[in-house]
Amino acid sequence: LSVQQGPNLLQVRQGSQATLVCQVDQATAWERLRVKWTKDGAILCQPYITNGSLSLGVCGPQGRLSWQAPSHLTLQLDPVSLNHSGAYVCWAAVEIPELEEAEGNITRLFVDPDDPTQNRNRIASFPG
């Protein structure tokens, strides 16, 4: 089982949308695939795919999941808020016929405030 995640870095403006893609491949067929998206180590969602369909379409706040055969799992965040900034990781495991798991590399999402002055204030608030 192979998982490739992209992009490595994603910078978007608050209120727009962000798309994270996870490509899941296996040489042999699978009956059930468990997938998981995490943000900063916390689980956003953990649905499974069987018969070509996701068991869940929602993934975290303002997150929508979709599966496009043969191998693309997409997490779409819309609209993006400042709280969406963080490190996202896609994980997958074939549950049937036999257990095999893999995870992607981190996608770092940076959300720029719609009002540029918020960014200055935020930077100014850091200690030191």
Partner: antibody, heavy 120, light 113 residues
Framework: QITLKESGPTLVKPTQTLTLTCTVS??????????WNWIRQPPGKKLEWLAL???????SYNPSLKSRLTITKDTSKNQVVLTMTNMDPVDTATYYC????????????WGQGTLVTVSS | DIVMTQTPLSLPVTPGEPASISCRSS????????????LDWYLQKPGQSPQLLIY???YRASGVPDRFSGSGSGTDFTLKISRVEAEDVGVYYC?????????FGQGTRLEIK
Amino acid sequence: QITLKESGPTLVKPTQTLTLTCTVSGFSITTGGYYWNWIRQPPGKKLEWLALIYTSGRTSYNPSLKSRLTITKDTSKNQVVLTMTNMDPVDTATYYCADMADKGGWFAYWGQGTLVTVSS
Amino acid sequence: DIVMTQTPLSLPVTPGEPASISCRSSQSLFSSNTKRNYLDWYLQKPGQSPQLLIYHASYRASGVPDRFSGSGSGTDFTLKISRVEAEDVGVYYCQQHYETPLTFGQGTRLEIK
């Protein structure tokens, strides 16, 4: 350019153990998402898949031969090794190694094969 | 194990004429999850290792002449050669990678009349 080359004894006596080595050049067997396979073909007969080993070290064997087979890899030498115990004349065949990727699943690269004869 | 059955086992063809090989599997090789058929075709020329012709039932491998085509889904598959050439001589195998153990058909020997 990826090349696979099988090596091992050409003649084995019945009941002995066969050890075959597949040396991979131009590509690291530690690369994620790849399976390294052994396939054999008795003279004039069909191809028969024997075993595979995945990047993670997970192995899978043909159930009909599972008790006799062991597949391992030596990453320091970039080699995949197959051992087959209790050899019999019916095991006389050309033995091939071949790679297979998660992206696709077909046998993309094959070695030239090595003929192993089992005879006393 | 999935059993792969090829017909015919021998196929004499006149150069320039078409040729067709059938492959049937004992269970479906189509996945509803990936929308793929886990079926490949190989040609083993005399004295050589097998070489990939068609993958996922209908996709021509890189460098394979367009006279070769694959079709079918589920349990029934076909390899067609639109105009046979002398260099096409050899044994053709279908192979499933839907599940392990990976299995091959018995092979179809194509020869020139």
